[in-house]
Interface confidence: low
């Protein structure tokens, strides 16, 4: 059941001392690109450095992740932080620099011979050996060991969207991240609040495809805030 999944001993239950906001598992996707914090160039000199606000890892550079800048800081205020190198502490894969992933709280090399097994182990630990399905998806996610050789196809494991082939993005699927199709016009999308407090999503959607943005569906304007339906709409 959904409750047993949410109560499982998983990444969401880790404390947030490393800057990883509680309830923010390092999402890869969702609001339309650039929609949350338009403007503001984060490529600045150190003496003129302005923290780049973010709601999710994909809003940051490939060598960064999105988190609260202070220990136990306000989960609502998150910025792009430099990725963690090998052997540094981590809470999720996106915290580790490219070529590494988070294993047992430490960034380790994504050696292709071990990567598949390690991640499958993590998923199995999170869900036990119960392979029943939720929303029609298998709890056990099969991962591609060729991830670092070719761009991941749909369903391949990934750390960030650049690991995926064109037309796909890296999105959370249970406690791992896999390549999923970028959303097309008319498809339902997820519009997160500016503060990035979007909680735990077991199944994340990709962002809207090029030339599209995630906006409230015209005929849903009168609906209550909680039930508003967002779809990918053309620019």
């Amino acid at each position: 059941t959904l409750n047993s999944v949410l109560n499982s001993n998983a990444i969401k239950n880790l404390p947030p001392p490393l800057g990883g906001a509680a309830g923010h598992p390092g999402s890869a996707v969702s609001a339309a690109p650039g929609i949350l914090y338009p403007g503001g160039n984060k490529y600045q000199t150190i003496d003129n450095y302005q923290p780049y606000p973010c709601a999710e890892d994909e809003e940051c550079g490939t060598d960064e992740y999105c988190a609260s800048p202070t220990r136990g800081g306000d989960a609502g205020v998150q910025i792009c932080l430099a990725c963690r190198k090998r052997r540094k502490r981590c809470m999720r894969h996106a915290m580790c620099c490219p070529g590494n992933y988070c294993k047992n709280g430490i960034c380790v090399s994504s050696d292709q011979n071990h990567f598949r097994g390690e991640i499958e182990e993590t998923i199995t630990e999170s869900f036990g050996n119960d392979h029943s399905t939720l929303d029609g998806y298998s709890r056990r996610t099969t991962l591609s060991s060729k991830m670092y050789h070719t761009k991941g196809q749909e369903g391949s494991v990934c750390l960030r969207s650049s690991d995926c082939a064109s037309g796909l993005c890296c999105a959370r699927h249970f406690w791992s991240k896999i390549c999923k199709p970028v959303l097309k016009e008319g498809q339902v999308c997820t519009k997160h609040r500016r503060k990035g407090s979007h909680g735990l999503e077991i199944f994340q959607r990709c962002y809207c495809g090029e030339g599209l943005s995630c906006r409230i569906q015209k005929d849903h304007h009168q609906a209550s805030n909680s039930s508003r339906l967002h779809t990918c709409q053309r620019h």
Epitope: P33, G34, P38, G167, C208, G209, E210, S213
Partner: antibody, heavy 115, light 108 residues
Framework: QVTLKESGPGILQPSQTLSLTCSFS??????????VGWIRQPSGKGLEWLAH???????RYNPALKSRLTISKDTSSSQVFLKIASVDTTDTASYYC????????????WGQGTL | QIVLTQSPVIMSASPGEKVTMTCSAS?????MYWYQQKPGSSPRLLIY???NLASGVPVRFSGSGSGTSYSLTISRMEAEDAATYYC???????????FGAGTKLELK
């Protein structure tokens, strides 16, 4: 094959309205997914997107210029029009029209430009 | 509005040399487009959706990147590649489209 050709008055006085026409062939703006956009380029400078219009009459404008721009189309005559109000010397540029499509997006076909 | 910063502004390369130019976005974008423009000519689409080669473009051109960092690579420079290259993106808020200021590639 797809071709686009821009035409305009050439010279205007400040504060007048610039009217540009893009005549195209090889595709139709009644076809789902088709669009035509306008981009300008001051001499020796970079490209600046002005506006575009989709087959279903959805219009998009450069936010910085939106109050001065009007884009429209005549599907039957295969033409797209752009009006720029209250022109001044900073509007001196080559104006290009270009075809866009929903998939793949990007300006795949360009006119030769009009100064 | 998302700002695209291209670097270098100007560069030169010898025939056969590998050339890479970059485009940095002030906010994350999902795809990047690259255009080539030669003096007196209209721009030409080279790369769409970050890494896809437009029709008729030589395979020595390639695009890559994600998030805020994108690049265009010419595997082996040829004389005819001397031109100015522009990156372009769509942004969602406000709905807009922006170009980078361009990278001028000269033949050494």
């Amino acid at each position: 094959q797809v071709t686009l050709k821009e035409s305009g008055p050439g010279i205007l006085q400040p504060s007048q309205t610039l009217s540009l026409t893009c005549s195209f062939s090889g595709f139709s703006l009644s076809t789902s997914g088709m669009g035509v956009g306008w981009i300008r380029q001051p001499s020796g400078k970079g490209l600046e997107w002005l506006a575009h219009i989709w087959w279903d009459d959805v219009k998009r404008y450069n936010p910085a210029l939106k109050s001065r721009l009007t884009i429209s189309k005549d599907t039957s005559s295969s033409q797209v029009f752009l009006k720029i109000a209250s022109v001044d010397t900073t509007d001196t540029a080559s104006y290009y029209c270009s075809r866009i499509a929903r998939s793949p997006t990007g300006f795949a076909y360009w006119g030769q430009g009009t100064l | 509005q998302i700002v695209l910063t291209q670097s270098p502004v100007i560069m030169s390369a010898s025939p056969g040399e590998k050339v890479t130019m970059t485009c940095s976005a002030s906010s994350s974008v999902s795809y990047m487009y690259w255009y080539q423009q030669k003096p007196g000519s209209s721009p030409r689409l080279l790369i769409y959706d970050t890494s896809n080669l437009a029709s008729g473009v030589p395979v020595r051109f390639s695009g890559s990147g994600s998030g805020t960092s994108y690049s265009l690579t010419i595997s082996r420079m040829e004389a005819e590649d001397a031109a100015t290259y522009y990156c372009q993106q769509w942004s969602s808020y406000p709905p807009a489209l922006t170009f980078g200021a361009g990278t001028k590639l000269e033949l050494k």
